[in-house]
């Protein structure tokens, strides 16, 4: 039945974004407000948990922005990256499924800077596996629900 | 039945990436290791061959990178592009379904440069048609399986 | 039945692209030529109208380009953006579902500039709701059907 197919669309919860410019895991996401929603999957401890074996299309859209009123950037040469990772509880290891991004030179000559990344791909996921998002420079994230989000939907069963 | 739906997720085989900065077809992809997989489609001669008529969602993620330890770039002004093309054997012609990319200025002021492209779209594909990937500056491709890949999955039949 | 699932893939009609550098709604799209197609959805007045309740995957690919032969840019600092919006006729309001893009410095040192944006996400859509595309700097849009397009396909019913 089409309505039984698992899906999730999670939007950034910007009230708890880590500091630092290194790669960090984003653990605060909305799952039940605005565009955010989830069905037959679970969101727990910052991870999207698979409840049903299958092949899923996974996607992420990550927006970074800086306005001069936010202060001076520590460096104008930035690596703005996203990594979509899969963790298996049985085998406690994390693997990157997809990555994207760009190095950027955000000079002081412009008062506003913006950059978005989109990644997507088709992956076999087993029940209990967890999907999480890591980004660099999290304090530059755009907190809007239309800007920074990730999701998944099941396309087909495993043979 | 959901499990009969064709799909493919092919990841770059970097052992055989062409040199040059012109537009080239990428013919070496993995289909059965790591995240790469294929079902009810065929991979042959660098092309993804459709075995079942239908409407498919096609996608590609292409990452380019350069580190100063790799040597000096021939030019700092680059066109980093991807073209997803469809070839029909019956009518021996090639058509671009999707394109994406960016012109970049990768100056020597930074030791590392990175850029990713993502494209995706919904297309009618007939049995025997072939999907291939062309890129500019192939020697700058990121060889990781999470970085450079393309794929397809069937969404619905043709009426 | 798989063949009853609504979908659309609309490609830019460049004969009627607005001028200006501000954010504008793109109203001219092809729905029945080349790669463009539509089924169980309606295209009217520049908007993609949902005819069937469901969860849909929405996507857009927007390419911008400039060649020096087109003349001098009014400013070299550009915001190249796309906004995928949903309008409900019942509640006459517009909401942005997805956004993407980048600020760019397109200097006169290079004769050609190019940049593409891709966004995608999974959304609940009700019959009568309308999807439209807004972009900044529409006069810089790439008019090719493989470059500038958007689409949707239904993945599952609403519970």
């Amino acid at each position: 039945k089409l309505e039984a197919q698992p899906f999730a669309h999670l939007t950034i919860n910007a009230t708890d974004i880590p500091s630092g410019s290194h790669k960090v895991s984003l653990s605060s996401w909305y799952h039940d407000r605005g565009w955010a929603k989830i069905s037959n999957m679970t969101f727990s401890n910052g991870k999207l948990i698979v409840n049903q074996d299958g092949f899923y299309y996974l996607y992420a859209n990550i927006c970074f922005r800086h306005h001069e009123t936010s202060g001076d950037l520590a460096t104008e040469y930035l690596q703005l990256m996203v990594y979509v990772t899969k963790t298996s509880i049985k085998i406690p290891s994390s693997h990157t499924l997809m990555k994207g991004g760009s190095t950027k030179y955000w000079s002081g000559n412009s008062e506003f800077h913006f950059y978005s990344i989109n990644v997507g791909g088709f992956f076999k996921l087993r029940s209990g596996e967890e999907i999480s998002i890591e980004v660099s420079n999290p304090s530059l994230l755009d907190p809007d629900q239309d800007a920074t989000y990730f999701g998944a939907f099941k396309v087909r069963d495993i043979d | 039945k959901l499990e009969a739906q064709p799909f493919a997720h092919l990841t770059i085989n970097a052992t055989d990436i062409p040199s040059g900065s012109h537009k080239v077809s990428l013919s070496s992809w993995y289909h059965d290791r790591g995240w790469a997989k294929i079902s009810n489609m065929t991979f042959s001669n660098g092309k993804l061959i459709v075995n079942q008529d239908g409407f498919y969602y096609l996608y590609a993620n292409i990452c380019f990178r350069h580190h100063e330890t790799s040597g000096d770039l021939a030019t700092e002004y680059l066109q980093l592009m991807v073209y997803v093309t469809k070839t029909s054997i019956k009518i021996p012609s090639s058509h671009t379904l999707m394109k994406g990319g960016s012109t970049k200025y990768w100056s020597g002021n930074s030791e590392f440069h990175f850029y990713s492209i993502n494209v995706g779209g919904f297309f009618k594909l007939r049995s025997g048609e072939e999907i291939s990937i062309e890129v500019s500056n192939p020697s700058l491709l990121d060889p990781d399986q999470d970085a450079t890949y393309f794929g397809a999955f069937k969404v619905r039949d043709i009426d | 039945k798989l063949e009853a699932q609504p979908f659309a893939h609309l490609t830019i009609n460049a004969t009627d692209i607005p001028s200006g550098s501000h954010k504008v709604s793109l109203s001219s799209w092809y729905h029945d030529r080349g790669w463009a197609k539509i089924s169980n959805m309606t295209f009217s007045n520049g908007k993609l109208i949902v005819n069937q309740d469901g969860f849909y995957y929405l996507y857009a690919n927007i390419c911008f380009r400039h060649h020096e032969t087109s003349g001098d840019l009014a400013t070299e600092y550009l915001q190249l953006m796309v906004y995928v919006t949903k309008t409900s006729i019942k509640i006459p309001s517009s909401h942005t579902l997805m956004k993407g893009g980048s600020t760019k410095y397109w200097s006169g040192n290079s004769e050609f500039h190019f940049y593409s944006i891709n966004v995608g996400g999974f959304f609940k859509l009700r019959s009568g709701e309308e999807i439209s595309i807004e972009v900044s700097n529409p006069s810089l849009l790439d008019p090719d059907q493989d470059a500038t397009y958007f689409g949707a396909f239904k993945v599952r019913d609403i519970d």
Partner: antibody, heavy 121, light 107 residues
Framework: QVQLVESGGGVVQPGRSLRLSCAAS????????MHWVRQAPGMGLEWVAV????????YYADSVKGRFTISRDNSKNTLFLQMNSLRAEDTALYYC????????WGYGMDVWGQGTTVTVS | DIQMTQSPSTLSASVGDRVTITCRAS???SSWLAWYQLKPGKAPKL??????SLESGVPSRFGGSGSGTEFTLTISSLQPDDFATYYC?????????FGQGTKVEIK
Amino acid sequence: QVQLVESGGGVVQPGRSLRLSCAASGFTFSGYGMHWVRQAPGMGLEWVAVISYDGINKYYADSVKGRFTISRDNSKNTLFLQMNSLRAEDTALYYCAKCLSGTYWGYGMDVWGQGTTVTVS
Amino acid sequence: DIQMTQSPSTLSASVGDRVTITCRASQSISSWLAWYQLKPGKAPKLLIYKASSLESGVPSRFGGSGSGTEFTLTISSLQPDDFATYYCQHYNSYSWTFGQGTKVEIK
């Protein structure tokens, strides 16, 4: 736990050089800018230098510009301050401190070491 | 250069008192102002950043306010552990400037 430990201080003659080190642990060192701040005997705090998380940007107080060099080795989680042409007025307790924000300047210094003493006489 | 002037330089108070320390800038500045506590033989401790944001783990009796040229650090009810020297610090255009300090001592 998050910790900064300075070393390399000592007694040195005017005009000579000294190199201070600051070993970081308990946080992702490569993600944060780092400062050197000093306190002369009986005086207040004085900012000396700062370096961005990637080592690209470095800024100095006017009093040390051209004489002191800040650097870092992210692979070893270590911050350095190379002090040349030392003067009597450089005598102080030298602290290293971590930037609260890795991306922006201006948010303050949230982790400090205990300091290392430099005496120029 | 922008000068930061703290007042008073010394403050005598008792446990339970409400204490206010002022930091004045020589010209109007942004809110990039922090407050620190320093005790002899100990590492300085960040209390407030961005003029009014309380650093994680700092007791809520500490508060920061102000804008333009005048900023204040307030301790709503002085505790025995609060006797120390307090410094304001301002950031502007890749330069960090400390005030001269305010010593809070037992009355």
